[in-house]
Amino acid sequence: VPRWRQQWSGPGTTKRFPETVLARCVKYTEIHPEMRHVDCQSVWDAFKGAFISKHPCNITEEDYQPLMKLGTQTVPCNKILLWSRIKDLAHQFTQVQRDMFTLEDTLLGYLADDLTWCGEFNTSKINYQSCPDWRKDCSNNPVSVFWKTVSRRFAEAACDVVHVMLNGSRSKIFDKNSTFGSVEVHNLQPEKVQTLEAWVIHGGREDSRDLCQDPTIKELESIISKRNIQFSCKNIYRPDKFLQCVKNPEDSSCTSEI
């Protein structure tokens, strides 16, 4: 008789999760010389230890501390790109602008990007059937707590001018409930961060509106200014041209507004 298993509302652990994490770790440490000292088996053991045999609605940031310690990484604090609801373009950008970094360009972010995982209380099994949904089940689930932890640390490390890419096609360009709005914004350190520069990415080719006037952008501006950080906002009317101009800044068409 099969043992009764908790049914959660979200998708289960990504198939071949342990193998994927281990393979990603090996690949990352090969590509990034500064992380060659990392022992990927230890990283996987620490990752596993954060959620295996624990109730998937009772995960804490402390559970991830051994993994955080092993994945400690120094990125240039003045070259950080945050993003909200526009991950693909942010990643395309940092693939071209190699001296800037999203969270997913760091080891820990790279390991977990697009993956789901959870375990079960009192068993060493990984749950491949279902995992808790943030809204429908619980917020203290393994995936949400992981991203909250690494996002907080990433924001805390930032300095000087921090950039954030925002999706101008969304009804809420700045969403207080996003990871950026709920975690990163509040963990930027005013003693280190002078300015937050928002890049609002336009969706439609004929969209010439100034999305920096959007009420949610003004809400972000207010939150940031109250934290004694300057706020800057720029419209990116043509994201395709924007990327092209990052690749080829000398192009004559790149002097005009993008």
Epitope: K192, E197, C212, F231, S232
Partner: antibody, heavy 119, light 107 residues
């Protein structure tokens, strides 16, 4: 190109209200904050206050009880009113644009206008 | 409020000389410091922000340094057009405050 120009009476009587206008061009008041500063003859600079792009204001506590900054976005104008003036308010008054959307320092300044407080 | 103190009040120098101007804050301003240049009858002109970031079109002979409460503006080789008054300003907290200025005059 970005320009700011202060205008208003060059002479104000003691106890009266000093009123100045800053007219801007080359950018929108919905995109940047405008600061007012002053410089008594032969002395240093003093920050008076700012009106942010959304219309909220911050003032220097030393002047807060006497100062009001407002704006008319459609006319691209920002006004400064300083009440109950004395000879100590004699200065060159500048308006200046914040460097970024919500900027705490200034990349473009008006040429300044000298206001003398005297009877 | 944060008090900004500049020294010396006046410097008498010749073209080509290296200039070092000092600005001290009454408390830590966390690198929120700008430098302006002002010539007689003109408005101040922004030179450097965030301690070290040179504004566009400002010559590379100007540079800034410092941290905490102590900051420095250096002009590596004084040009005739550099004779002016230099002000530092903190933007860590309101009210934003300025030093009293250092006048760089021709010897």
């Amino acid at each position: 190109q970005v320009q700011l120009q202060e205008s208003g009476p060059g002479l104000v009587k003691p106890s009266e209200t000093l009123s100045l206008t800053c007219t801007v061009s080359g950018f929108s008041l919905t995109s940047y904050g405008i600061h007012w500063l002053r410089q008594p003859p032969g002395k240093g600079l003093e920050w008076i206050g700012v009106i942010w792009r959304g219309g909220s204001t911050d003032y220097n506590p030393s002047l807060k009880s006497r100062v009001t900054i407002s704006k008319d976005t459609s006319k691209s104008q920002v006004s400064l009113k300083l009440s109950s003036v004395t000879a100590a308010d004699t200065a060159v008054y500048y308006c200046a644009k914040g460097k970024v959307t919500t900027g705490f320092y200034f990349d473009f300044w008006g040429q300044g206008t000298l206001v003398t407080v005297s009877s | 409020e944060i008090v900004m103190t500049q020294s010396p009040p006046t410097l008498s120098l010749s073209p080509g000389e290296r200039v070092t101007l000092s600005c001290r804050a009454s408390e830590d301003i966390y690198n929120r410091l700008v430098w302006y240049q002002q010539k007689p009858g003109q408005a101040p002109r922004l030179l450097i922000s965030g301690v070290t970031s040179l504004e566009t079109s400002i010559p590379a002979r100007f540079s800034g340094s410092g941290s905490g409460t102590d900051y420095t503006l250096t002009i590596s080789s004084l040009q005739p057009e550099d004779f002016a008054v230099y002000y530092c300003q903190q933007y860590w907290s309101t009210p934003y405050t300025f030093g009293q200025g250092t006048k760089v005059e021709i010897k």
